[in-house]
């Protein structure tokens, strides 16, 4: 695409509409104004939340900001390079409307002239909405995208990022001949050279996946990543997958084969984070095969997430979910064959006597 364009669809792009001023927020020439001519195809009126609570404009490829610290003049509200220090570029979606009202004023005459609005009665933040809906400015938040491979240990993309003197507000294939989408995990790729591939949801197991030809299940071993269980789960989910579940001895054997030669402890989908009772797989597979190490699981109020360990030939332990570890994702591509009958195993709510653990 064009320089700086995200190669992925942009579901989280929106126009910012003021009921009080009856217009949309537009960035132009380093300044912002409210214009009555709302236009969803005009990049200068298209906004998105990006990393670190910043608001990015697709027309100027800059972030909304004010002088630092918080000077309350209309002139100080404007568009700035997203990596500018000594500026306030961070906004809370809930209070952004109040701040826009304060900084832009509320006089409705001459509203399409930048920088000429007088301070009038403040409109409430409730007067600022996503154009075309009654949703507030928190309705389309930024979602962190966890990287695969690369050299960032699974850390999320930094959006926007600068590469080859251009700003990118999403994953891009620019600079790659293989067409894979990637992002930088710090703001300036040229300075830090930290990057990773972006997760994609696909129905095949081509890139980044190992396929078990017997079961058609696909596995992704992120040995270089260091994420918490929650982040690892989110990374798998972003690829249309889930953390690894192991439901039979064949699968455990296959996994052990792929772990051969590694010394690692990796997050899998085992957890007891749901009150419905006991340990379960995050993909809702039945827990019908067990490979706990001896004396595991333990510490029920502190260690609620499961790992697989190469040191114990693929045995399972429970650990504190906040520990940063590598992880394994699993997905089953959409089968075109006859649908399999429902498994007679099922997760049911487990109630135990006081002296027993589910």
């Amino acid at each position: 695409g064009a320089p700086g364009d995200a190669a992925l669809p942009e579901p989280n792009v929106f126009l910012i509409f003021s009921h009080g001023l009856q217009g949309c927020l537009e960035a132009q020439g380093g300044q912002v104004r409210v214009t009555p001519a709302c236009n969803t195809s005009l990049p200068a009126q298209r906004w998105k939340w990006v990393s670190r609570n910043r608001l990015f404009n697709l027309g100027t490829m800059q972030c909304l900001g004010t002088g630092w610290p918080g000077t309350n003049t209309t002139a100080s509200l404007g568009m700035y390079e997203c990596d500018r220090e000594a500026l306030n570029l961070r906004w809370h979606c809930r209070t952004l409307g109040d701040q826009l009202s304060l900084l832009l004023g509320a006089r409705t005459s001459n509203i399409s002239k930048p920088g000429t609005l007088e301070r009038g009665d403040q409109t409430r933040s409730g007067q600022w909405r996503i154009y075309g809906s009654e949703e507030d400015l928190c309705a389309l938040p930024y979602h962190e995208v966890y990287t695969i491979q690369g050299n960032s240990h699974g850390k999320p993309c930094t959006i926007p990022f600068k590469y080859d003197n251009q700003w990118f507000h999403g994953c891009t294939s620019t600079g790659r001949e293989d067409g894979h989408l990637w992002c930088a995990t710090t703001q300036d790729y040229g300075k830090d050279e930290r990057w990773g591939f972006c997760p994609i949801k696909s129905n095949d197991c081509e890139t980044f996946w190992d396929k078990d030809q017997l079961t058609d299940s696909c596995y992704q071993f992120n040995f270089q990543s260091t994420l918490s269980w929650r982040e690892a789960w989110a990374s798998c989910e972003q690829q249309g997958a889930d953390l690894l579940s192991i439901t039979e001895i064949h699968e455990q054997t296959y996994i052990n084969g792929l772990l051969t030669g590694y010394s690692s402890t990796l997050w899998i989908g085992l957890n007891d984070l749901d009150t419905s009772g006991g340990w379960q797989w995050s993909d809702n597979s039945p827990l019908k095969y067990l490979n706990w190490e001896s004396d595991q699981p333990d510490n029920p109020s502190e260690e609620n997430c499961g790992v697989i360990r190469t040191e114990s030939s693929g045995g399972w332990q429970n650990r504190d979910c906040s520990i940063a570890l590598p992880y394994v994702c699993k997905k089953k591509p959409n089968a075109t064959a006859e649908p399999t009958p429902p498994d007679r195993w099922a997760n049911v709510k487990v109630e135990c006597e006081p002296s027993w653990q589910p």
């Epitope: 918490s228 982040e231 984070l273 504190d320 906040s322």
Partner: antibody, heavy 117, light 108 residues
């Protein structure tokens, strides 16, 4: 059914002491870490202290360190909070809370501690 | 211990949707839990884990999370939903717990 019942609250003068108790039932008390959480009148919730299942590891918020001691008696399914050198800012409802997995899923009804001269 | 930041107050018209947000570093490692508290009562867990509700909590309550931000959404707010809402998560190692400052939800 899990139940937590606090007791021991009351009116005490600044510098005084109180001992709160929490009687637990309906679950394997010795397996769980336990917590005290407080709420000053009209204010938000504040975690105060916790104690690991075997009682050998305790943690507390900075403002009560050296004054409050959390303890437990697993044979009695009971949790305690010994509060010394009480200050006016310790006035609050004190809740006993049992953690689930990454959350505090069972709470008592609370006991009110008022520190006033 | 880490801090969790919430909006102090938010209002919603009866039957409309309201979203409460919570931000903090511990939310990168743990899912947020959300508690409802009415005057004179103990907090009640309403949403936890990915987007789970304890039994008895209506399905109009839902949760989501991304990065260091968690959200509680009440879809079709009812008069009885007027209360204070607190987010909560453990800090690393589950040695302490962080609470948000609370959000007062008013149903108009």
């Amino acid at each position: 059914e899990v139940q937590l019942v606090e007791s021991g609250g009351g009116l005490v003068k600044p510098g005084g002491s109180l001992r709160l108790s929490c009687a637990a039932s309906g679950f394997t008390f010795p397996s769980y870490a336990m917590n005290w959480v407080r709420q000053a009148p009209g204010k938000g919730l504040e975690w105060v202290a916790n104690i690991k299942p075997n009682g050998n590891e305790r943690h507390s918020v900075e403002s009560v360190k050296g004054r409050f001691t959390i303890s437990r008696d697993n044979s009695k399914n009971s949790l305690y909070l010994q509060m010394n050198s009480l200050r006016a800012e310790d006035t609050a409802v004190y809740y006993c809370a049992r953690p689930g997995a990454g959350r505090l899923d069972y709470w008592g009804q609370g006991t009110l501690v008022t520190v006033s001269s | 211990s880490s801090e969790l930041t919430q909006d102090p107050a938010v209002s919603v018209a009866l039957g409309q949707t309201v979203r409460i947000t919570c931000q903090g570093d511990s939310l990168r490692s743990y899912f947020a839990s959300w508690y409802q508290q009415k005057p004179g009562q103990a907090p009640v867990l309403v949403v936890y884990f990915k987007n789970n509700r304890p039994s008895g909590i209506p399905d109009r309550f839902s949760g989501s999370s991304s990065g260091n931000t968690a959200s509680l959404t009440i879809t079709g707010a009812q008069a009885e939903d007027e209360a204070d809402y607190y987010c909560n998560s453990p800090n690393s190692g589950v040695i302490s717990w962080a609470f948000g400052g609370g959000t007062k939800v008013t149903v108009l």
